[in-house]
């Protein structure tokens, strides 16, 4: 039987157990240099000589409820959010600062998950329905990933779910929010 | 107090059929998630169909799917469960459990109230 | 489905803390139920969703549920705690109800 497919705010419902590399998302915000926001600086390309690892980007546990449509998961799970600016940590603001020191004005990089881990749940619905288990999508690990020119931001990360089939015996609920409405919510995370 | 009465059980051969009833009081009965529940002499509990208050769930276990069915009168407070093609291995004592729910979405939906169970006996 | 595993069977000695287990494979996310069935009689449910107490059920039954185990806890065990007890939850992708093959407690 295959798993339904479902997305959750910061979750997604998979067909599939493991862990899930995922590729370099072909994204760029396209923004131009500001030398006002860059401290009248000269034109600065930190990216280009420094290694990715000495970026920083965080890695931040919360837990929440999976829900699809009036459907609760009995447990709430734990997940990571990634955040942070994907610059080297030498030059991102330190508590004191009161806004960007720089704005890269070469390729753009930012903090968004790397691997997925695959939990089971049990999922709760009202109205005399069964309790089920589910397969859902966790974010496992961070990583800052260079975007560029051809996607815009809304794009950065769309996972692709299949609509969800009606389970035998039971009338089909109707989604609680579109994809890409909760997919909106899953990057303002960021 | 919660009392369920199972009844309809009895001596039957292979693909034979068979109507077994719960008789349940002490609750309002249409309000309840209600379930069969059936066990092998000298062997563990095994789950069969569920059904929701207004009829409108009904589940079932792989193997009795397609063979059982479950179904509820709320005016007379009685849980039926027509059995078809039975086979050896559905020889077991059906027991109807009502289901304890809580809360909005009802909880873990656990069994809390259990009849004294049927025999249902398949054999030639 | 998961599949709840169970010992066969768990001694304890009067007065001492009986414990039962109940495996499977990320269970601490499901809620799990306990039944107490005595020979010759029907199950009744002394934990429900993982550690709560129906009305009646005293009090030195308790229950836990984490990781891949659950477990069913019996503080000073009386004779009358001797019965089979059986795990189970609703683990099932279409809905099912699974049960642990049950285990028996013996009380020395």
């Known amino acids: 039987q295959g798993w339904q497919a479902f997305k959750n705010d910061a979750t997604e419902i998979i067909p599939e157990l493991g862990e899930y590399p995922e590729p370099p998302p072909e994204l760029e915000n396209n923004k131009t240099m500001n030398r006002a926001e860059n401290g009248g600086r000269p034109p600065h390309h930190p990216f280009e000589t420094k290694d990715v690892s000495e970026y920083s980007c965080r890695e931040l546990h919360f837990t929440r409820y999976v829900t699809d449509g009036p459907c609760r998961s009995a447990k709430p799970v734990t997940e990571l959010v990634c955040s942070g600016q994907c610059g080297p940590a030498r030059l991102l603001p330190n508590a004191i600062g009161r806004g960007k020191w720089w704005r890269p004005s070469g390729p753009d990089f930012r903090c968004i998950p790397d691997r997925y881990r695959a939990q089971r749940v049990q999922l709760l619905c009202p109205g005399g329905e069964a309790p089920r288990a589910r397969k859902v999508r966790l974010v496992a690990s961070c990583k800052c990933k260079r975007l560029t020119r051809f996607h815009n931001q809304s794009e950065l990360k769309d996972f692709g779910t299949e609509a969800a089939r009606p389970q035998k015996g039971r009338k089909p609920r109707p989604r609680a929010r579109s994809a890409k409405a909760n997919q909106a919510e899953l990057e303002n995370a960021y | 107090q919660v009392q369920l009465v199972e009844s309809g059980g009895g001596l039957v051969q292979p693909g034979g059929s068979l109507r077994l009833s719960c008789a349940a009081s002490?609750?309002?009965?249409?309000?309840?998630?209600m379930n069969w529940v059936r066990q092998a002499p000298g062997k563990g509990l095994e789950w069969v169909s569920f059904i929701s208050g207004d009829s409108s769930n009904t589940y079932y276990a792989d193997s009795v799917k397609g063979r059982f069915t479950i179904s509820r009168d709320n005016s007379k407070n009685t849980l039926y469960l027509q059995m078809n093609s039975l086979r050896a291995e559905d020889t077991a004592v059906y027991y109807c459990?009502?289901?304890?729910?809580?809360?909005?979405?009802?909880?873990?939906?656990?069994?809390?109230?259990w009849g004294q169970g049927t025999l249902v006996t398949v054999s030639s | 489905d998961i599949e709840l595993t169970q010992p066969p069977s768990v001694s304890v000695a009067p007065g001492q803390t009986a414990r039962i287990s109940c495996s499977g494979d990320n269970i601490g996310s499901f809620y799990v139920h306990w039944y107490q069935q005595k020979p010759g009689q029907a199950p009744v449910l002394v934990i429900y969703d993982d550690n709560n107490r129906p009305s009646g059920i005293p009090e030195r039954f308790s229950g836990s549920n984490s990781g891949n185990t659950a477990t069913l806890t019996i503080s000073g065990t009386q004779a009358e705690d001797e019965a089979d007890y059986y795990c189970a939850s609703w683990t099932g992708v279409e809905p099912d109800y699974v049960f642990g093959g049950g285990t028996k407690l013996t009380v020395l």
């Open positions: 459990a009502r289901t304890f729910m809580h809360g909005h979405l009802g909880g873990g939906l656990s069994m809390d109230f």
């Open positions: 002490g609750f309002t009965f249409s309000s309840y998630v």
